[in-house]
């Protein structure tokens, strides 16, 4: 049979300008001599030769003398691929051929690494910075292979994605210089961190800038709404709760609040020149008029509906202003599936049945996962369709097409991707001849 | 820093409209209130109205009532005063100012527009 | 409509010397007025805001006072550079909406 030549599976990491040995072996049948062997390592993709060694003798490398093999080693079976002062380019696949009375071949992977510096952070503009200005934050690390993932969190480690712009170049020795750039609105004041991965290396480099504006020469109004979206049921009442730091000496005279549709700018409810002026928004709000004084302008939404839906602004004014947006998440949780099936009598194995999974009445969209009775999820011939009602509720029907075996159970799980809830149905199809639902 | 720009000088004829912008850069347009002031040849600083663009609302002085109009387009960061029905008094220089996010005080304002209204 | 009227219309005085310029409400303001200093061919320059606060980069020699009806700007030590015209402006509470006073013009004697 052919010879078996064996290499790693996984790629061989290697650092920039060190060392690596690219292993490969096979297993000499009893009198073997490397008179007999002719080992061949070259390039897979050009084909271009690298090292040899044929009749006996090391031939050399054929690749810039950076390549040598382990002459003593050869013997026992010991192929490998001594690679020296590795460089960026020496990356890929790279094939050992080993040729005796027959011959075999693998292939190993070569994958070059470098670690990013620690990033230096820079700041445009760098002075006279007031909360509400744009700045930018420029992260720059250097000398890394392969390309960098760059993540953006601020002091609370929530993740930072818009306005980030990154670029990579590659200098002559193909390693990266990584330089990310993130537009970001002060606040009163904030820290902001960059890290550079390596994702081959696993190695985070991280830098990070705290800046604190000077108080601006009319100090706005901070106001505070949840960071995470407020969710609701249908039909129950919603708190979307904002709040603001009264001055000493603060009276209600002063405070102006407006609640808008972020998008619309549809009015909702507001308070000004001393008074509540009621709901604009189908008498259906309400504000907290005892803890008004206290900075407390959160807004009561009653009976809420799907169409309520979306992001809400708590505009407030005393001797400046500020506002914040707060998001309302409308969800219901969906019906107990029921499950038909049909046909839904005289059932044999091989018989070809549909399964239809219905659920009522949800929001948003269900996910519907089917599985068969040993938990192995069925996704071939599955075909699901959500229709909303005049509410905007959800009504779900999803249908399995399979082959029946001697027996078997169908589950179906309709799933409330905001609520986490999970509703279950299942059949089972014993037997055969079989009606289904069983007769009493 | 937030700098205001406004659009060129105007010549307009009476009777005419003209539209002035200006154009924000440097922060948080929508959180601004923008004012726009005018000043004729030789007199005082007259307020003709403002906006706060995150809430969509206009506010005019009694005396421009129904002959201004004051918007703000968020995706451009920019404002927009309309003067309609412009006579020979409406001659002057006029400026857009603010005080930045959330502040009421103008300690920013354009380098102004000339409108010149003459037959 | 709140009616500002400044006082005195120009007020004459050398460098050095201490100026003094009063502006005065229709009807209480609470303590929304700012000044404003204006030079020709310039915009105009925030000095104060909030009866008494000194905007950012404003020398201290400008102060200003007052709460209600009456307020003052006050230059304690007049320099070259601030012969100019001083206007202040009221902001009503909501909406909010300005008012300015006609104008102070400083002048040296």
């Known amino acids: 049979g052919a010879l078996e030549v064996q290499v790693p599976e996984d790629p061989v990491v290697a650092l920039v300008g060190t060392d690596a040995t690219l292993c490969c072996s096979f297993s000499p049948e009893p009198g073997f001599s490397l008179a007999q062997l002719n080992l061949i390592w070259q390039l897979t993709d050009t084909k271009q030769l690298v090292h040899s060694f044929a009749e006996g003798q090391d031939q050399g490398s054929a690749y810039a003398n950076r390549t040598a093999l382990f002459p003593d080693l050869l013997a026992q079976g010991n192929a490998s691929l001594r690679l020296q002062r590795v460089r960026v380019a020496d990356e890929g696949s790279f094939t050992c051929f080993v040729s005796i009375r027959d011959f075999g071949s693998a292939a190993v992977s070569l994958q070059v690494a470098a670690p990013y510096s620690k990033p230096s952070m820079t700041l445009e503009p760098n002075k006279d910075l007031r909360p509400g200005d744009t700045v930018t934050i420029t992260c720059s690390s250097y000398q890394g292979y392969p390309e960098a993932e760059v993540f953006w969190q601020d002091g609370q480690g929530v993740p930072l994605t818009g306005n980030v712009t990154t670029s990579q170049m590659a200098n002559e020795q193909g390693l990266f210089d990584v330089h990310s750039i993130l537009r970001v609105v002060l606040g009163a004041n904030g820290t902001y961190s960059c890290l550079v991965r390596n994702p081959v290396l696993q190695q985070d480099a991280h830098s990070s800038v705290t800046i604190t504006p000077q108080r601006s020469p009319t100090g706005a109004v901070e106001v505070q709404v949840p960071e995470d979206p407020v969710v609701a049921l249908v039909g129950t009442d919603a708190t979307l709760r904002c709040s603001f730091s009264p001055e000493p000496g603060f009276s209600l005279a002063q405070l102006n609040l407006i609640w808008q549709l972020t998008d619309t700018k549809q009015l909702v409810h507001s308070f000004t020149e001393g008074r509540d002026q009621g709901s604009a928004y189908a008498n259906r709000t309400a504000l907290f008029p005892d803890l008004l004084a206290q900075g407390n302008a959160s807004l009561r939404l009653q009976r809420v509906r799907v169409a309520d839906e979306g992001s809400f602004t708590c505009f407030v004014s005393i001797r400046d202003f500020g506002s914040a947006a707060v998001s309302l998440q409308v969800a219901a949780p969906y019906s107990k599936p029921s499950m038909t099936l049909e046909p839904n009598k005289d059932l044999r194995p091989g018989d070809t049945v549909t399964i239809t999974c219905s659920s009522y009445r949800g929001y948003p969209e269900a996910e519907v996962f089917w599985q068969d009775g040993q938990g192995v999820p069925l996704t071939g011939n599955v075909t699901t369709s959500q229709m909303a009602n005049e509410q905007g509720l959800f009504d779900v029907h999803s249908v399995l097409r399979v082959v029946l075996g001697a027996n078997g159970t169908y589950s179906c799980l309709v799933r409330n991707p905001v609520l986490q809830q999970d509703a279950h149905g299942s059949v089972t199809i014993t037997g055969q001849p079989m009606t289904f639902p069983p007769e009493a | 820093q937030v700098q205001l720009q406004q659009s060129g000088a105007e010549v307009k004829k009476p009777g005419s409209s003209v539209k002035v912008s200006c154009k924000a850069s440097g922060g948080t347009f929508s959180s601004y209130a923008i004012s726009w002031v005018r000043q004729a040849p030789g007199q005082g600083l007259e307020w003709m109205g403002g906006?706060?663009?995150?809430?969509?609302?206009?506010n005019y002085a009694q005396k421009f009532q129904g002959r201004v109009t004051i918007t703000a387009d968020e995706s451009t960061s920019t404002a927009y005063m309309e003067l309609s029905s412009l006579r020979s008094e409406d001659t002057a220089v006029y400026y857009c100012?603010?005080?930045?996010?959330?502040?009421?005080?103008?300690?920013?304002w354009g380098q102004g527009t000339m409108v010149t209204v003459s037959s | 409509e709140i009616v500002l009227t400044q006082s005195p219309a120009t007020l004459s005085l050398s460098p050095g010397e201490r100026a003094t310029l009063s502006c005065r409400a229709s009807?209480?303001?609470?303590?929304?007025l700012a000044w404003y200093q204006q030079k020709p061919g310039q915009a105009p320059r925030l000095l104060i805001y909030d009866a008494s606060n000194r905007a950012t980069g404003i020398p201290a020699r400008f102060s200003g006072s007052g709460s209600g009806t009456d307020f003052t700007l006050t230059i304690s030590s007049l320099e070259p550079e601030d012969f100019a015209v001083y206007y202040c402006?009221?902001?009503?509470?909501?909406?909010?909406?300005?008012?300015f006073g006609q104008g102070t013009k400083l002048e040296i004697k």
């Open positions: 402006q009221q902001r009503s509470n909501w909406p909010p909406s300005y008012t």
């Open positions: 009807q209480s303001v609470s303590s929304y």
């Open positions: 906006i706060i663009p995150i809430l969509g609302i206009a």
């Open positions: 100012a603010t005080g930045g996010s959330g502040r009421y005080a103008l300690d920013i």
